[in-house]
Interface confidence: low
């Protein structure tokens, strides 16, 4: 399926609006510090060029690859060296090395100011004055802060963003209409970004075999009535889509995602009974809906797995003939029977099964050796079950804020070398698992909790890779994707850590505390808590609780005072002294 001009092919397939949106996202994800106007100019130039290629595919440069065209365009940015330093060296390279170089310089934690939400009237005026620029600005701001955001999904978010403003800027109470919608989009967007970041890490750090195994397990849970060959086809196509998006090939990715949605909707009967309502929707919504579709009902008459995978005398023969096929079918069969297991658990079981076959198929009596293989799964299954049970009990007992604090203490003791902002961000997100998953019925708790934790821990891994400070974190992040969460769970207090020297400045607070939102206050307190643990890693829960209770009382007292700043200046040192004494 070769085309004389790739850029013309993608422009025609995607249409001008999506083409321009995707090119803007691609450029913003690569050059995260460039001003909006510069990106818009580059996108317009690329779009005009694409139109000339649509008119005449044999026109000059139209036969060049998209990487060549886009890379050449990015390398025209005049301030590349000043703004990006060594990233400018990428421009001296030839494709495909140049694109790889740009990818390596994507920054997961760019030094960009947090997005401030203007007044509703200000936003509505901007929306009405120039809708197109307003929506481009949204794509740009999200893409530069989330350089691995799933591009076709970001177009769907932008469509919802537009719909929210179109509806709410007409409403009697604009703020009451708009703000909850924007909060929802923000939270969903952050979750979507983190989920996609795990997919890209899986592909980039562990290869497409790891991603395919994940996809086989997840799609088999979603589509338990589909045949293995059908699941395999979907896995192949999905792997291609995500490989492209993670590799910066956003036009190809969006085009292939649309093809996959089309294929799924044309073959619903052999995939799932749950696809129908998705397939009636327009493209962006349809693709989103298909990605989020609920699990189909399991076929009623599924036989026991033991017959083919334990009791059969042909297990080693079948395994030796095509190891990946046999293991893939095992994973498919196990996953379609277990929507109640996390994907990561299913992958651990497949790994354990593979290890048993490797050992037993070389033994004198293979059948005797692997006869008890399913019994070996029991501890692997019970470990996440117990973890979810214990943590949900703790969450229900403490509530979200205090549950986050318990996790902050736990993780700071495990890996105290990690920066305080990273520990606060990651532990706060780990703590959100409670509200997200603990209210669900038993059968949905583990897949919700463990697969969510995998996403959050990947964020820790990605941030740590940028600035490595802990061998333990490196080990848990790089040794095995499926065992990351158990690896972190198993970490104990780091005995080798030298406690951080006490710094009174860290525990000095001012009257600006009183004007912070509830969330910002929590972050301030949790930052102090992490610093306390870094200073006294062996402090008991009771000691830490006492200090944090005193802290809350001190802040509350000073925020009620007439002269707030004077209160903080007077009471602050007393709080610090009392805390040091309590922790001595």
């Amino acid at each position: 399926d070769t085309h004389k001009s790739e850029v013309a092919h993608r422009f025609k397939d995607l249409g001008e609006e999506h083409f321009k949106g995707l090119v803007l996202v691609a450029f913003s994800q690569y050059l995260q510090q460039c001003p909006f106007e510069e990106h818009v100019k580059l996108v317009n130039e690329v779009t005009e060029f694409a139109k000339t290629c649509v008119a005449d595919e044999s026109a000059e440069n139209c036969d060049k690859s998209l990487h060549t065209l886009f890379g050449d365009k990015l390398c025209t940015v005049a301030t590349l060296r000043e703004t990006y330093g060594e990233m400018a060296d990428c421009c001296a390279k030839q494709e495909p090395e140049r694109n790889e170089c740009f990818l390596q310089h994507k920054d997961d934690n760019p030094n960009l100011p947090p997005l401030v939400r203007p007044e509703v009237d200000v936003m509505c005026t901007a929306f009405h004055d120039n809708e197109a620029t307003f929506l481009k600005k949204y794509l740009y701001e999200v893409a530069r802060r989330h350089p691995y955001f799933y591009a076709p999904e970001l177009l769907f978010f932008a469509a919802r963003y537009k719909a929210a403003f179109a509806e709410c800027c007409q409403a009697a109470d604009k703020a009451a209409c708009l703000l909850p919608k924007l909060d929802e989009l923000r939270d969903e967007g952050k979750a979507s970004s983190a989920k996609q970041r795990l997919k890209c890490a899986s592909l980039q750090k562990f290869g497409d075999r790891a991603f395919k195994a994940w996809a086989v397990a997840r799609l088999s849970q979603k589509f338990p009535k589909a045949e293995f060959a059908e699941v395999s086809k979907l896995v192949t196509d999905l792997t291609k889509v995500h490989t492209e998006c993670c590799h910066g090939d956003l036009l190809e990715c969006a085009d292939d995602r649309a093809d996959l949605a089309k294929y799924m909707c044309e073959n619903q009967d052999s995939i799932s009974s749950k696809l129908k309502e998705c397939c009636d929707k327009p493209l962006l919504e349809k693709s989103h809906c298909l990605a989020e579709v609920e699990n189909d009902e399991m076929p009623a008459d599924l036989p026991s797995l033991a017959a083919d995978y334990v009791e059969s005398k042909d297990v080693c023969k079948n395994y030796a003939e095509a190891k990946d096929v046999f293991l893939g079918m095992f994973l498919y069969e196990y996953a379609r029977r277990h929507p109640d297991y996390s994907v990561m658990l299913l992958l651990r079981l497949a790994k354990a099964y593979e290890a048993t076959l490797e050992k037993c198929c070389a033994a004198a009596d293979p059948h005797e050796c692997y006869a008890k293989v399913f019994d070996e799964f029991q501890p692997l299954v019970e470990e996440p079950q117990n973890l979810v049970k214990q943590n949900c009990e703790l969450f229900e007992q403490l509530g979200e804020y205090k549950f986050q604090n318990a996790l902050l203490v736990r993780y700071t003791k495990k890996v105290p070398q990690v920066s305080t902002p990273t520990l606060v961000e990651v532990s706060r997100n780990l703590g959100k698992v409670g509200a997200k998953c603990c209210k669900l019925p038993e059968a949905k708790r583990m897949p919700c909790a463990e697969d969510y934790l995998s996403v959050v821990l990947n964020r820790l891994c990605v941030l740590h890779e940028k600035t490595p400070v802990s061998e333990k974190v490196t080990k848990c992040c790089t040794e095995s994707l499926v065992n990351r969460r158990p690896c972190f769970s198993a970490l104990e207090l780091d005995e080798a850590y030298v406690p951080k020297a006490f710094n009174a400045e860290t525990f000095t607070f001012h009257a600006d505390m009183c004007t912070l939102s509830e969330k910002e206050k929590q972050v301030k307190k949790q930052t102090a808590l992490v610093e306390l643990v870094k200073h006294k890693p062996k402090a008991t829960k009771e000691q830490l609780k006492g200090v944090m209770d005193n802290f809350a009382a001190f802040v509350e007292k000073c925020c009620k005072a007439d002269d707030k700043e004077a209160c903080f200046a007077e009471e602050g040192p007393k709080f610090v002294a009392a805390s040091q004494a309590a922790l001595a």
Epitope: K212, K233, T236, D324
Partner: nanobody, 115 residues
Amino acid sequence: QVQLVESGGGLVQAGGSLRLSCTASGSIESINRMAWYRQAPGQQREFVARISKGGSTNYPDSVKGRFTISRDNAKNTVYLQMNSLKPEDTAVYYCAAGPVWEQFWGQGTQVTVSS
């Protein structure tokens, strides 16, 4: 379904060369990986070479440096160039293919290396 047809097998002297071909037909758009396996009498089937759609290859140590797998996507054909053949390379050679794993198999072609 995908159909695979191997050709190019035969009798060759030790130290000689052979080139096997395998042509795929049917639902080939889903094929990502193609491979060669072999099975000697009384032995288990053994992996020989694999190539992905993008062209990345891998081989076991027993054939590395002697065998080369290549692929012509336009002709839906995969080749196995076998040089410096040894008597222990005697086997039925099977072509295999699949979207994620090699799940479709050919009938096999006999390769005999005489000393």
